[in-house]
Interface confidence: medium
């Protein structure tokens, strides 16, 4: 089971209208540039076999990957939204840095790895797709971590 007290975010993180709006605007701009509508990164498959109490830990893994491998390298795109959203998401990642799971997390890593592989396989269009799903990432973090 996760160390659940550490796998939490205060709901105030998701109640800031300005940065919430900027996150959704960024996702919208990127999704307009995403021409691959057949693939969904954050969906039912991501959560398959993962209990509700483990979902925040899973979303932490997805958030860290998105920051490190997608948002930082793509940070020149989709301005002015990216400039404000990336530090906001980095702060959320930082607040989840003590969120761990005691015991086997192989089932979670397997699901996250599939998402990573999909992004890598699609190349730059995969990264654009990941940015286009930041609204889903935001909502999934909120639902899983508060």
């Amino acid at each position: 089971a996760p160390i659940s007290s550490h796998c939490r975010l205060d709901k105030s993180n998701f109640q800031q209208p300005y940065i919430t709006n900027r996150t959704f605007m960024l996702a919208k701009e990127a999704s307009l540039a995403d021409n691959n509508t057949d693939v969904r990164l954050i969906g039912e498959k991501l959560f398959h076999g993962v209990s509700m109490s483990e979902r925040c830990y899973l979303m932490k893994q997805v958030l860290n990957f998105t920051l490190e491998e997608v948002l930082f390298p793509q940070s020149d795109r989709f301005q002015p939204y990216m400039q404000e959203v990336v530090p906001f998401l980095a702060r959320l990642s930082n607040r989840l840095s003590t969120c761990h799971i005691e015991g086997d997390d192989l089932h979670i890593q397997r699901n996250v790895q599939k998402l990573k592989d999909t992004v890598k396989k699609l190349g730059e269009s995969g990264e654009i797709k990941a940015i286009g799903e930041l609204d889903l990432l935001f909502m999934s973090l909120r639902n899983a971590c508060i």
């Epitope: 930082f72 390298p73 940070s75």
Partner: antibody
């Protein structure tokens, strides 16, 4: 050889201005974010500013916001720091550093290459 | 702002001996911690990144460990060229990088 070379430092009065430059060579400058870090005499290191690879986004420490501005010219492989309304506490050696970016093999995420620094002295 | 605190401020060790430098963060920085070495009149040089990974050119005698808030840089057997100032740095609170105040490693 990967190299960063700062210039433009010197003695300036409080309230004055300076423009620092950092010439990059030996790597694909346009694919990396770049940062300025400063070090007051005998003190520790302080992050000043970061700019993304093509200049689309800039970030500044609160202590310099509105006074120091980072920019870059990728056609000249050069990073800049425009310094206005300088204060005595801005006296420091200013280093430019290669920040995160993407290579064929990985995403580089640390300040792995630094210039030799240029000294800015603010004094009346 | 995440505050990084290094200890001790000055560490006196003899060549050939082991040196252990500590760095503590005011809140968790996960494993996003780097160590830099700085010699007088020179720029800092990246030694360790992501807590324990050696940067290109860093000798094997340097190792990093820790996670969360407490980190350690260990030099297994000190060489004369290792005497310098060492800084830790977090990049967890991006882009607000913060550094420790430094530990001066001097010859005993």
């Amino acid at each position: 050889e990967v190299q960063l070379l700062e210039s433009g430092g010197g003695l300036v009065q409080p309230g004055g201005s300076l423009r620092l430059s950092c010439a990059a060579s030996g790597f694909t400058f346009s694919t990396y974010a770049m940062s300025w870090v400063r070090q007051a005499p005998g003190k520790g290191l302080e992050w000043v500013s970061t700019i993304t690879s093509s200049g689309g986004a800039t970030y500044h420490a609160d202590s310099v916001k509105g006074r120091l501005t980072i920019s870059r010219d990728n056609s000249k492989n050069t990073l800049y720091l425009e310094m206005n309304s300088l204060r005595v506490e801005d006296t420091a050696v200013y280093y430019c550093a290669k920040d995160w970016g993407r290579t064929v093999y990985a995403v580089i995420k640390d300040l792995d290459i630094w210039g030799q620094g240029t000294l800015v002295t603010v004094s009346s | 702002e995440i505050v990084m605190t290094q200890s001790p401020a000055i560490l006196s060790v003899s060549p050939g001996e082991r040196a252990t430098l500590s760095c503590r963060a005011s809140q968790s920085v996960s494993n996003y911690l780097a160590w830099f070495q700085q010699k007088p009149g020179q720029a800092p040089r990246l030694l360790i990144y992501d807590t324990s990974k050696r940067a290109t050119g860093t000798p094997a005698r340097f190792s990093g460990s820790g996670s969360g808030t407490d980190f350690t840089l260990t030099i297994s057997s000190l060489e004369p060229e290792d005497f310098a100032v060492y800084f830790c740095q977090q990049r967890s609170d991006w882009p607000q990088y913060t550094f420790g105040q430094g530990t001066k490693l001097e010859i005993k």
